[in-house]
């Protein structure tokens, strides 16, 4: 595969990663698919410094990140360990709230208006952030 050495047009470089900030909304799964089609993933926040960078760019708007517990435990989409990693939940979150009346609980994480995280219904059409790492060889599957 070929290595990506600079960010694509309309993406923002920061600390050897590239970020793309949507300006419209999709459900979490659709946002996840969008990032994958860009050979990227929903943003994975690994430090307070990265949190501040993303928060600065998204402003006070609900925005999906690459964290969910749709299969039980909380997981980052790129395999980053959740338990030992950076977290920035709002107080008393995540709460898997069932009181919204939309069926089920809350399985997808988003940045709230103050940047701290909340779990919410994955079908809500929030903005999202894609991330891809520079110097990472793109995995091109062999042609059969």
């Amino acid at each position: 595969g070929s290595e990506r050495t600079c960010c694509p047009v309309n993406w923002v470089e920061h600390e050897r990663s590239c970020y793309w900030f949507s300006r419209s909304g999709k459900a979490w799964a659709d946002a996840d698919n969008y990032c994958r089609l860009e050979d990227a993933h929903l943003v994975v926040v690994t430090s307070w410094e990265e949190q501040k960078f993303v928060q600065h760019h998204i402003g006070p708007v609900n925005t999906w990140m690459g964290l969910h517990d749709q299969n039980g435990p909380w997981k980052w989409v790129d395999g980053t360990d959740y338990e030992t990693g950076f977290k920035n939940w709002r107080p008393e979150q995540p709460d898997d709230w069932y009181g919204h009346g939309l069926g089920g609980g809350e399985d997808c994480a988003h940045f709230t208006d103050d940047g701290r995280w909340n779990d919410d219904v994955c079908q809500r059409p929030y903005r999202w952030v894609c991330e891809t790492e520079l110097d990472k060889a793109s995995q091109e599957p062999p042609l059969l």
Partner: antibody, heavy 118, light 107 residues
Amino acid sequence: EVQLLESGGGLVQPGGSLRLSCAASGFTFSSSAMNWVRQAPGKGLEWVSVISGSGGYTYYADSVKGRFTISRDNSKNTLYLQMNSLRAEDTAVYFCAKRNTDDAFDIWGQGTMVTVSS
Amino acid sequence: DIQMTQSPSSVSASVGDRVTITCRANQDISSWLAWYQQKPGKAPKLLIYAASNLQSGVPSGFSGSGSGTDFTLTISSLQPEDFATYYCQQANSFPWTFGQGTKVEIK
């Protein structure tokens, strides 16, 4: 000039196989997600499949899942569609199309006809 | 799957007429909608993306509007080369789906 050129269509019997190709030029192929869209005779458009720029991610319409495989060779700027277990209802003109960042199809090939008949 | 319904299925109009085509989604798709023009024997051509953005090279007589579930393609003054079939496409979620098409014919 930005261009997509499909080839590989033809007449095939039900249950048979065919591989379509789409040669791209005039844009950065390796960073563009690519699609196949088909149109049965006298009918509307049906999206078939998409593949990310690296080839690492694919998605299919339910009507072709498990029978069709989308792939690409970025060294040759070429997109492929391997079609197996073909059915009469797969008869259509097959277009390759480039995806833009708003998930619309901004560049189209001229199409190649696939006829499935005994 | 998200279903897209266009109306009318065909329209007869004269050069210079204002033509409006509507597209309705059976669920909210925000602004994730595109419009295409197709002439017989040819590939579709992108006219409008993100509901209201005019594709580069497309005449300004074409415009798109709407969000949520209801969308409109307007041709402000029909030209001879505009007689064709028009399709909407939702890009909100997989599988991406098209409307059934609207044929604009000469009156």
